[in-house]
């Protein structure tokens, strides 16, 4: 065979990934690999991830002679050990006036009265703890409730008998019930006064309120 067909182990170099070829015999060679590579021709990237140092659920991503940690959203840093301040990153993390409190590995919301849930978006059902009298209807409000009374009942909790039921107000007067004590309040038409609007008054005095 001609000299041009002679095998020269390192020409061209079989070493890849920056490896350096060294001829060790007539037909043999050895590759000196750059850090992070291995194999007879440096063809293999060494996996640097076994027993990696990524913490708090960080995922190891192999590199060349190194690795990176892909951190969950609440962690950051080289090894996912630095807490992300979600309160800074998300100024509106807590709704309805709630206060954001950063914590290691997350955050919490301190909700104002009447709101609950992770982000204070849930209106607390105040009717769950309300004591509206049976037969009345509870209406949930923010940090409060109100009771809708059936006919004949009055008071904040519908626990009082409605004094207006007996029509105590005369002469077309308006009858209202005091929600605190269940007593009636007559709003007298022009020309009448008294608790029941039964008394005449002088002209010029109008719309008297009388409590009973």
């Amino acid at each position: 065979a001609g000299s041009d067909s002679l095998y020269v182990p390192c020409a061209p170099s079989p070493c890849v990934n920056g490896g350096t070829c060294r001829q060790t015999g007539d037909f043999t060679f050895e590759c000196n690999c750059l850090p992070g590579f291995e194999g007879s021709t440096c063809e293999r990237n060494i996996d640097d991830c076994p027993n990696h140092r990524c913490q708090n659920g960080g995922v190891c991503v192999d590199g060349v002679n190194t690795y990176n940690c892909r951190c969950p959203p609440q962690w950051t840093g080289q090894f996912c050990t630095e807490d992300v301040d979600e309160c800074l990153l998300q100024p509106n993390a807590c709704q309805n006036g709630g206060t954001c409190a950063n914590r290691n590995g997350g955050y919490g919301c301190v909700c104002v009265n009447g709101w609950s849930g992770d982000d204070c978006s849930e209106n607390i059902d105040d009717c769950a703890f309300a004591s509206c009298t049976p037969g009345s209807t509870c209406i949930d409000r923010v940090a409060s409730f109100s009771c809708m009374c059936p006919e004949g009942k009055a008071g904040l909790l519908c626990h009082l008998d409605d004094a207006c039921i007996s029509n105590p107000c005369h002469k077309g007067a308006l009858c209202d019930t005091n929600p605190l004590n269940g007593q009636y309040i007559c709003t007298c038409p022009q020309g009448y006064k008294g608790a029941d609007c039964t008394e005449d008054v002088d002209e010029g005095n109008s719309h008297h309120h009388h409590h009973h």
């Epitope: 027993n51 140092r53 913490q55 708090n56 590199g63 190194t66 080289q78 050990t81 630095e82």
Partner: antibody, heavy 117, light 112 residues
Framework: EVQLVQSGAEVKKPGESLKISCKGS????????IHWVRQMPGKGPEWTGY????????KFNEKFKGQATISVDKSSTTAYLQWSSLKASDTAMYYC??????????WGQGTLVTVSS | DVVMTQSPLSLPVTLGQPASISCRSS???????????LHWFQQRPGQSPRLLIY???NRFSGVPDRFSGSGSGTDFTLKISRVEAEDVGVYYC?????????FGGGTKVEIK
């Protein structure tokens, strides 16, 4: 508050075995590796190795491979550094540490190991 | 392993005066993620090391603002703007960019 509390000082003879401990508290123990750092008298600290409490996997500084073992007991949130046959050259202060903002952010108070015949 | 060289070995300082410690690495400490993992520790006599500065220039919580860090690549500096009596001790730099993590040999700060 993150705390690492180590066992007390030990005086041993060459060839004896030893196990020192580091109890972690104030954080989720399984989520963080525990490192062991050696500091020989009058010298700077040297990273020895670490253990992953969740899996029990360990990684060592090549310089210290085969000289000691690291183990963990998750139930008591405690990591251990153990020698089967001590040498005089093992005399040093041994610290456990945990990562945080920087490498080795939280440290134990140290355990002084003295090996002398 | 990456070799961390600190200078000076010993630093006598006057109270209230500034102090500066240098740390050089045998190779660049810029990680493939773009960050530089160079940290500074203080070790007071008879105590455990304490983190002062992480990632070149970030002060750890509770560290007085008289401590500051700077540098890039292979050259880093820790500065104390006005030395106080409680600053006496040995200061170490540490790199965690390359495996294994390696410390500098230390600089002893003492009062003149």
């Amino acid at each position: 508050e993150v705390q690492l509390v180590q066992s007390g000082a030990e005086v041993k003879k060459p060839g004896e075995s030893l196990k020192i401990s580091c109890k972690g508290s104030g954080y989720t123990f399984s989520n963080y590796v525990i490192h062991w750092v050696r500091q020989m008298p009058g010298k700077g600290p040297e990273w020895t190795g670490y253990i992953i409490p969740g899996s029990g996997g360990t990684k060592f500084n090549e310089k210290f491979k085969g000289q000691a073992t690291i183990s963990v007991d998750k139930s008591s949130t405690t990591a251990y550094l153990q020698w089967s046959s001590l040498k005089a050259s093992d005399t040093a202060m041994y610290y456990c540490a945990r990562d945080g903002a920087g490498s080795f952010t939280y440290w134990g108070q140290g355990t002084l190991v003295t090996v002398s015949s | 392993d990456v070799v961390m060289t600190q200078s000076p070995l010993s630093l006598p300082v006057t109270l209230g005066q500034p102090a500066s410690i240098s740390c050089r690495s045998s190779q660049s400490l810029v990680h493939s993620d773009g960050n530089t993992y160079l940290h500074w520790f203080q070790q007071r006599p008879g105590q455990s090391p304490r983190l002062l500065i992480y990632r070149i220039s970030n002060r750890f919580s509770g560290v007085p603002d008289r401590f500051s860090g700077s540098g890039s690549g292979t050259d880093f500096t820790l500065k104390i703007s006005r030395v106080e009596a409680e600053d006496v001790g040995v200061y170490y730099c540490l790199q965690s960019t390359h495996f294994p993590d390696t410390f500098g040999g230390g600089t002893k700060v003492e009062i003149k």
